[in-house]
Interface confidence: low
């Protein structure tokens, strides 16, 4: 299709080489009352179709995205050629940063509903650059945490080094939806609630003598509880002895509950004590069996192919640890009688 009639928007993504970050493009198709370029010819009031081609966000869920190759080749369907770009309704998600994402992206409705829709499309010219060392050293992260129940704020990474007074007007989106009230480089949240979690996008306009473009940054916001003040507790095994049958296989499970920590490095391991010796056992990987806002339950098993007499003289110790401290629970095997 002919893209010469598409509206054009220029965007800049300056990514940090220090962190993982994502990027999004919205298919900002014009609303009927604003758009003259959606119609092939200007219509006189009498000719306005009864159902305008675009009825706001309801119609935007079914759009097609293309990339325009720089060599003049035909438009490429994003879904077929770019595995690191994901389409979600009218949003295009870039999962990894890189200058190779620079280019022209075009979106248009999948369904042509009327002859007036033909030129209803948006062309986004995206320029991607790594952040230079001269940029602000302490810019806000693209992953920000808000503490549930407290006051918090979400900062626009590309503007976090500027004072509120210097900052240009910012347009914020949350999960693709415009936050019309917010215009500064920081969103202040009076009471952090679970639904403040999500993908926030901040846009502002930058101009030079030739043209203007939109500078965009994406912030993943997570709502969290405060870090635990407790060391982990072992939920299983509860008993310190276990009846077993000699010669039979045995699995002993260690389940431990770890309180939430922003920097989470849980340790759960088995070791064996035999008289004065003790050594760590190579066991299957630990797995998370339950995760809530406040804590996580992790399980790790020790597997004995056959229980031997020697195992009856040993102690099997589960050791768990977080940044606060550690807990252990030992199990002595006892032969089942009768």
């Amino acid at each position: 299709f002919n893209i010469s009639g598409c509206s054009t928007k220029k965007l800049l993504w300056t990514y940090s080489t220090r962190s993982e970050e994502e990027f999004v493009l919205f298919c900002d198709l014009p609303e009927p009352q604003k758009s003259h370029f959606c119609h092939r010819n200007r219509l006189s009031p009498k000719q306005v179709p009864e159902h305008l081609p675009f009825m706001g966000s309801n119609d935007l869920s079914d759009v097609q995205w293309y990339q325009q190759p720089s060599n003049g080749d035909p438009l490429e369907d994003i879904r077929k050629s770019y595995p690191h770009i994901i389409q979600d309704k009218c949003t295009l998600h870039f999962l990894t940063p890189g200058v190779n994402n620079s280019g022209s992206y075009i979106c248009r409705p999948k369904m042509i509903k009327s002859p007036y829709d033909v030129a209803c499309c948006v062309k986004m010219i995206l320029e991607v650059k790594p952040q230079t060392n001269a940029s602000c050293e302490y810019s806000a992260s693209h992953k920000q945490d808000l503490l549930l129940g407290s006051t918090g704020s979400i900062s626009c990474p590309s503007l976090s080094c500027q004072s509120d007074a210097q900052s240009p007007a910012v347009t914020w989106y949350k999960n693709g939806k415009l936050l019309s009230v917010e215009r500064s480089n920081r969103i202040v949240v009076d009471e952090v609630y679970d639904y403040h979690q999500g993908t926030y996008v901040c846009d502002y306009t930058q101009s030079d003598t030739v043209s203007s473009w939109t500078v965009r940054a994406v912030v993943q916001v997570r709502t969290i509880v405060g870090d635990t003040k407790l060391k982990p507790d072992i939920l299983d095994p509860v008993e310190d002895t276990l009846e077993v049958e000699l010669g039979k296989p045995l699995t002993i499970s260690c389940k431990a509950r770890f309180g939430f920590e922003r920097v989470f490095n849980p340790v759960i391991k088995w070791y064996i004590k035999d008289s004065d010796l003790e050594w760590e056992v190579s066991v299957p990987e630990a797995k998370s069996i339950k995760s809530t806002l406040k804590d996580e339950i992790i399980e790790r098993n020790i597997i004995l192919e056959k229980v031997t007499q020697r195992d009856l003289r040993r102690k099997f110790v589960c050791f768990v640890q977080n940044s606060i401290g550690n807990t252990t629970q030992s199990v002595q095997l006892k032969e089942k009688r009768g």
Epitope: K177, V181, E191, Y193, D194
Partner: antibody, heavy 111, light 112 residues
């Protein structure tokens, strides 16, 4: 303080809009919640609207109610009332902390 | 959706006594639980927010605690003015599609 208005006797199927008005503070920056209470029954949560005008509803209330806001009011529209919608309707400031409530407005749905 | 089970439905106690009301959540709701007091013909009044925080102007005779998914409201040194119906309300997940009625069934407190 908050005050609800618009409650009255309506026949089943007649749409009805209730309005919540604040005095002493601006509604603009607050999450606002609607709750109802049938005669002699417990409280029933309907939904809330955030400062950006996005409404969120209890699962049972979706499609039956519409919450909207202007800079000075928060409205609750009952699209097609039935006898089960007979109740006192309250609006409250906040979601996790409902610190200010209106006195309620009574809606009676009857033939 | 989260179901709040409030017990008992009714409780009677003497002036000066103590009453305990429990609310059990069907799943983890962090500390997103409020307690309200309602007297006949009046709107609910906030007593406790975020599980254990006393709302402004509420006497310290009202105490609330949380243990996992069980939440408790304790009223000590009962006064005649405490006769009312008490409701717990969970507000966790209020934007989820399956969010149902957030309130417990209510507990009527009768003061003798």
């Amino acid at each position: 303080s908050l005050e609800e208005s618009g409650g009255r006797l309506v026949t089943p199927g007649t749409p009805l809009t209730l309005t919540c008005t604040a005095s002493g503070f601006s509604l603009n920056n607050y999450y606002m919640t609607w709750v109802r209470q049938a005669p002699g029954e417990g409280l029933e949560y309907i939904g809330f609207i955030d400062p950006y005008s996005s409404p969120y509803y209890a699962s049972w209330a979706k499609g039956r109610f519409t919450i909207s806001r202007t800079s000075t009011t928060v409205d609750l529209k009952i699209s097609s009332p039935t006898a089960e919608d007979t109740a006192t309707y309250f609006c409250a400031r906040g979601v996790a902390v409902g610190d200010i409530w209106g006195p309620g407005t009574l809606v009676t749905v009857s033939l | 959706d989260v179901v709040m089970t409030q017990t008992p439905a009714s409780v009677e106690a003497a002036v000066g006594g103590t009453v305990t009301i429990k609310c059990q959540a069907s799943q983890s709701i962090s500390d997103y639980l409020s307690w309200y007091q309602q007297k006949p013909g009046q709107p609910p009044k906030l007593l406790i927010y975020r599980a254990s925080n006393l709302a402004s102007g509420v006497p310290s005779r009202f105490k609330a605690s949380e243990s996992g998914t069980e939440f408790t409201l304790t009223i000590s040194d009962l006064e005649c003015a405490d006769a009312a119906t008490y409701y717990c309300q969970c507000t966790f997940g209020a934007t989820n599609d399956d969010y149902g009625n957030a309130f417990g069934g209510g507990t009527e407190v009768v003061v003798k």
